[in-house]
């Protein structure tokens, strides 16, 4: 069950973790001691589900979190918007070389919407994600964390859907929101010709040819 959130008209949302009511129930590996689902409140006092991990004291961390299957709905390129907090290692006493300040984002294309396990070698790395500003002493409030936003895109996609995965290697992270969307060119009318909603191409600069039709009471 999802609640509605308002996004730009040219973006079609495939996944919005903040709109899910109840637990997200994504798959974590290991099952315990890694990523943990945590409920917090948004500014409207509505519960939102987040995932957090903070094993900064222990070396050799390899904690994975995988979303449910995401249908691509014909989109060849999708965008991933992540809102997260990330702890500055300098603010954590005694963590030395074990603390990291990045995490990794992966995807895996699949026609199977019910894969139960995380097979790390199937996933393709999208990018290493770092905070634009970690939250230690943001302004003067050391109990208030800056919410970072990073957007990445991936494509061309060809299978029915895909899974996203987040790999922690020893950082202190909270994933507050994950949104996956594709872009479309909205319905347009030019010179009495109507062009339908059209999903953008595989590349950001791709031109997609689309056939128009005459508006009512006009002829070709």
């Amino acid at each position: 069950v999802t609640g509605s959130r308002v996004y730009p008209a040219n973006e079609v949302t495939l996944l919005d973790s903040r709109s899910v009511q109840g637990e997200l129930g994504w798959i974590a590996s290991p099952l315990e001691g890694g990523w943990e689902e945590v409920s917090i409140m948004d500014e409207k006092n509505t519960p939102i589900r987040t995932y957090q991990v903070c094993n900064v004291m222990e070396p050799s961390q390899n904690n994975w979190l995988r979303t449910d299957w995401i249908t691509r709905e014909g989109a060849q390129r999708v965008y991933i918007e992540i809102k997260f907090t990330l702890r500055d290692c300098n603010s954590l006493p005694g963590v030395m070389g074990t603390c990291k300040e990045t995490f990794n984002l992966y995807y895996y294309e699949s026609d199977n919407d019910k894969e139960r396990f995380i097979r790390e070698n199937q996933f393709v790395k999208i990018d290493t994600i770092a905070a634009d500003e970690s939250f230690t002493q943001v302004d003067i409030g050391d109990r208030i964390m800056k919410l970072n936003t990073e957007i990445r895109d991936v494509g061309p996609l060809s299978k029915k859907g895909f899974y996203l995965a987040f790999q922690d290697v020893g950082a202190c992270i909270a994933l507050v929101s994950v949104r996956v969307f594709y872009k479309k060119c909205p319905l347009t009318v030019r010179n009495l010709a109507q062009f339908p909603d059209t999903i953008t191409g595989a590349d950001t600069s791709s031109l997609v040819e689309v056939r128009g039709s005459c508006v009512n009471n006009s002829e070709e």
Partner: antibody, heavy 126, light 112 residues
Framework: EVQLVQSGAEVKKPGSSVKVSCKAS????????ISWVRQAPGQGLEWMGG????????NYAQKFQGRVTMTRDTSISTAYMELSRLRSDDTAVYYC???????????????????WGQGTMVTVSS | DVVMTQSPLSLPVTPGEPASISCRSS???????????LDWYLQKPGQSPQLLIY???NRASGVPDRFSGSGSGTDFTLKISRVEAEDVGVYYC?????????FGGGTKVEIK
Amino acid sequence: EVQLVQSGAEVKKPGSSVKVSCKASGGTFSSYAISWVRQAPGQGLEWMGGIIPIFGTANYAQKFQGRVTMTRDTSISTAYMELSRLRSDDTAVYYCARELLYCSSTSCGTHGFDIWGQGTMVTVSS
Amino acid sequence: DVVMTQSPLSLPVTPGEPASISCRSSQSLLHSNGYNYLDWYLQKPGQSPQLLIYLGSNRASGVPDRFSGSGSGTDFTLKISRVEAEDVGVYYCMQALQTPLAFGGGTKVEIK
């Protein structure tokens, strides 16, 4: 309705340690911060420190640094506060208190101590 | 560290009449996100404290609407529009912007 239930009163000798527990019933324990606040007889409230999950490690008031350890065991929904090298002026009621976590569009923080334990009286006397 | 100063120390009140408590911080509690990190608590005799107001002006769940919080930066006020007998106790303000969190010294509200 979430409740925080603390361990019973303690009488301790100077130089010893005390460990107070705070068990949550109801709600998701991992979803909120736990702070510890103490109140000496006839005095005001004093914040000792706390653990905010998405901040990572415990955060202690400088006054108690090196003497206090705060931990939590999410599997049994219990938080602990251990104070060592006790002195007579540590005689006080020790409270655990819950803080809800929230995120706005630009930042994350906490929403005040909305639920308190009943308090644990710790008496330090020779 | 932020220092919190409350006044008055003691406040004798008449039921049905309004009451006001002032709290001043040594540093601004207004964050760039627009929130004032100031909470108000009431500790009734023999009880644990209870949250009345968070983030300067937001009433906590179950708190009667006769309680209101106002102010910004360094100066804050808790108002009780019509005092009731059950409102007696010690009122504390607390800054929650940065560690160490700090409480005011308290204001004891008692019936005249």
